[in-house]
């Protein structure tokens, strides 16, 4: 007799891991034999989809590999024409293994800042993140965290946050656990003991002392007055991350002795400083006005303008001289890279010389003004046009700082080298001849001035600027 | 009463070809998934391949696919398994099995007598 | 494949013993396995089938259980006539495969 279908085996939720086998079993009594079809969340499952497996009329439906895509509702439906089609449903579950996908990696970080280790995790059910940092479990405080993506934050790095973290996940089906990483806790170089300034006799020996710390242990280099240290003995102990520097000295002169902590961050250096004044009993003090020092330049952008070896004088009126000196040239030469080319090497020497003046090292260090002719020179023959314009834009306030103003000397109130040839510098590097001159293109309607003397010539020339003079 | 029996077995050298064949009575042949299980010499049970009733699903032990062909004859209540480059490691005796949906998946419920196929050089 | 270990590969004991043999499947099969009995020379025949059903005409000194990925099958009360192989077979897949059987041997 005829029967209506009836499903006496209903489908149940199945559990599977990811490439494992799932099996739906959809049960069905009927006369004549009934038709099954399957459904995945109410989509027609395609029978002939080699991912599945049909077995005895469809009764069993197998997911032969399953997928993370494969979790859903399914559903068969059983019809022999006879009577309603019946239907039962089950879900499948697709469970996975806890897995690392976005494992932690070594991290270099500097105190204080906020570190964050990632770990991303993959599973179902959801796995739940732990850390070990060395053989313990990490516990967590107001500090340190473990995110609810797994990943460990830490805020305010301290040094003892370093060492051996891996991340570990967890569910019902196993554990993963992540490769061990290095938290390293960098330190920005600090000065523990800085050197002691000394008012001595003439002749004497001073140590002078520094210790320093970071992560890495910094190194230590003394500056005099601005320059390396050329004489005196040097002695360096390093112990538990501490560097002691000794500065051994025979005084001869008054000096501003400076200790310079320097560690190295990734591609950034912190440095820390910390200075010592030696004075000399009875010692002349220096002009109210020249308040400075002689030293060798060593910046970049005059480089090519100074002579090799060029002693210079620092003002101590800026905090670090070298520095506050080398900026505004850098400025200056900044807005030379408009002019023409006549006028620019002439220009850069002059500012080069006038920022950075010839110092007289005697015993009060003295800057040496460059000579008026050479700043009209540079001002009337071969920036004139240049001139102009920018005393222009001066009056009519149209440069974004004053700092330029410093940059260009006023030729007038500068020694003529006629009063006094030792009283101002000369420049040597620009070079010409009088008998040259009318080869010149006219740059200025009106005649200099003032009558430019014979330059002295340069003996050595690094680029040719015209055929009349050149410049280095 | 549910009867199978096998047919075909003998000595082949490796290399060479061999049909079995299972004959079916009893039961509705064409209704039922048809299945060969094989044991070597002193060895345990192992499934070699199943067809369904209508030869729609059929189904190869990883090991074994390419090499051996199953096959049925509905009209004539016959099942084979056709057996090509033979080797000495196919030397074992061939169960012709009828498979039947249990109360949870399948079980073989009826086994025939055994087919011994001996492979040697 | 699901693999099926079953162990142990053979045991002796004493008529009227209680007799238990283990199969592990390598993941979750549900119920769907079955028990088989070898006497030799002879074919397989079917005793347990979706884990614990017991087929008509076997004795009911023989039953089944599951628990997780692990199936038993006990003896309770050895017979001499039960010497013989046992195996499991899993149907979740279709790639059936059967555990490597336990020898049942009388004292």
């Known amino acids: 007799l005829p029967k209506a279908p009836v499903i006496t085996t209903p489908l149940e939720t199945v559990d599977a891991l990811v490439e494992e086998v799932a099996t739906f079993m959809c049960a069905v009594e009927s006369y004549p034999q009934p038709e099954i079809s399957w459904t995945r969340n109410k989509i027609l499952i395609k029978l002939f989809d080699t991912r599945y497996s049909i077995r005895e009329n469809g009764q069993l439906l197998t997911i032969l590999s399953v997928e993370d895509s494969d979790d859903g509702i399914y559903c068969c439906t059983a019809n022999n024409g006879v009577g309603g089609a019946v239907e039962s449903c089950g879900a499948l579950q697709v469970k996975m293994k806890p897995k690392i996908t976005r494992p932690p990696i070594n991290v270099k970080i500097i105190e204080g800042l906020k570190a964050v280790l990632p770990c991303t995790t993959m599973g179902n059910p959801k796995p739940s993140v732990s850390w070990i940092k060395g053989d313990s479990p990490l516990r967590e405080n107001s500090r340190i965290a473990v995110l609810e993506s797994g990943s460990l934050r830490i805020h305010n790095v301290q040094k003892e946050d370093a060492g051996q973290y891996r991340c570990v996940a967890k569910n019902s089906l196993g554990t993963a656990y992540s490769k061990v990483v290095k938290l390293e806790v960098e330190v920005f170089a600090r000065i523990l003991r800085a050197p002691e300034s000394h008012n001595v006799t003439f002749g004497s020996f001073v140590t002078l002392h520094c210790t320093a710390t970071g992560i890495p242990v910094p190194t230590i280099t003394w500056i005099e007055n601005g320059n390396a240290v050329s004489s005196g003995s040097i002695q360096e102990s390093v112990k538990d991350r501490v560097i002691d520097s000794r500065l051994q000295l025979f005084i001869t002169k008054p000096g501003l002795y400076t200790c310079i902590a320097t560690n190295k961050h990734g591609e950034k250096f912190s440095t820390a400083k910390a200075a010592a004044t030696i004075s000399i009993a009875e010692w002349s003090k220096p002009q109210k006005d020249n308040k400075g020092y002689c030293a060798q330049y060593r910046g970049e952008v005059c480089n090519a303008v100074l002579a090799k070896d060029a002693l210079v004088f620092l003002n101590t009126s800026y905090a670090d001289p070298e520095e506050a000196q080398e900026l505004l040239v850098h400025t200056a030469w900044n807005e030379l890279k408009v002019v023409s080319p006549v006028c620019r090497p002439a220009a850069e020497a002059l500012l080069c010389n006038h920022i950075f003046q010839e110092c007289s090292p005697g015993v009060v260090p003295t800057p040496i003004p460059i000579c008026r002719e050479y700043c009209l020179a540079v001002k009337e023959l071969f920036c004139a046009k240049e001139w102009l314009v920018m005393e222009e834009k001066t009056h009519r306030g149209l440069y974004r700082s004053e700092m330029h103003l410093l940059s260009v000397p006023e030729c007038s109130k500068l020694p003529s080298m006629h009063w006094d040839p030792t009283a101002c510098a000369r420049l040597p590097h620009l070079d010409y001849n009088k008998e040259n001159l009318k080869t010149f293109p006219p740059m200025t309607s009106s005649k200099p001035s003032v009558d430019i003397p014979n330059l002295p010539s340069s003996s050595s020339s690094s680029f040719s600027v015209s055929p009349t003079y050149s410049m280095t | 009463e549910d009867l199978l029996v096998e047919s075909g077995g003998g000595l082949v050298k490796p290399g060479q070809s061999l049909t079995l064949s299972c004959a079916a009575s009893?039961?509705?042949?064409?209704?039922?998934?048809m299945a060969w299980v094989r044991q070597a010499p002193g060895k345990g049970l192992e499934w070699v391949a199943s067809?369904?009733?209508?030869?729609?699903?059929?189904y190869y032990a990883d090991s074994l696919k390419g090499r051996f062909t199953l096959s049925r004859d509905n009209a004539r209540n016959s099942f084979f398994l056709e057996m090509n480059s033979l080797r000495a490691e196919d030397t074992a005796v061939y169960y012709c099995a009828r498979e039947r949906l249990l109360r949870l998946g399948v079980g073989f419920d009826s086994w025939g007598q055994g087919s011994l196929v001996a492979v040697s050089s | 494949d699901i693999h099926m270990t079953q162990s142990p590969s053979s045991l002796s004991s004493s008529v009227g013993d209680r007799v238990t043999m283990t199969c592990r499947a390598s993941q979750r099969i549900s119920g769907f396995v079955n028990w088989y009995q070898q006497k030799p020379g002879r074919a397989p025949t079917l005793l347990i089938s979706?884990?614990?059903t017991l087929q008509s005409g076997v004795p009911s000194r023989f039953s089944g259980s599951a628990s997780g990925t692990d199936f038993t099958l006990t003896i309770s009360g050895l017979q001499p006539e039960d010497s013989a192989i046992y195996y499991c077979?899993?149907?979740?897949?279709?790639?059936?495969?059967f555990g490597q059987g336990t020898k049942v041997e009388i004292k």
């Open positions: 009893g039961f509705d042949f064409s209704a039922s998934t």
């Open positions: 067809v369904s009733g209508d030869s729609h699903h059929i």
């Open positions: 979706a884990a614990s």
């Open positions: 077979q899993q149907s979740y897949s279709p790639l059936y495969t």
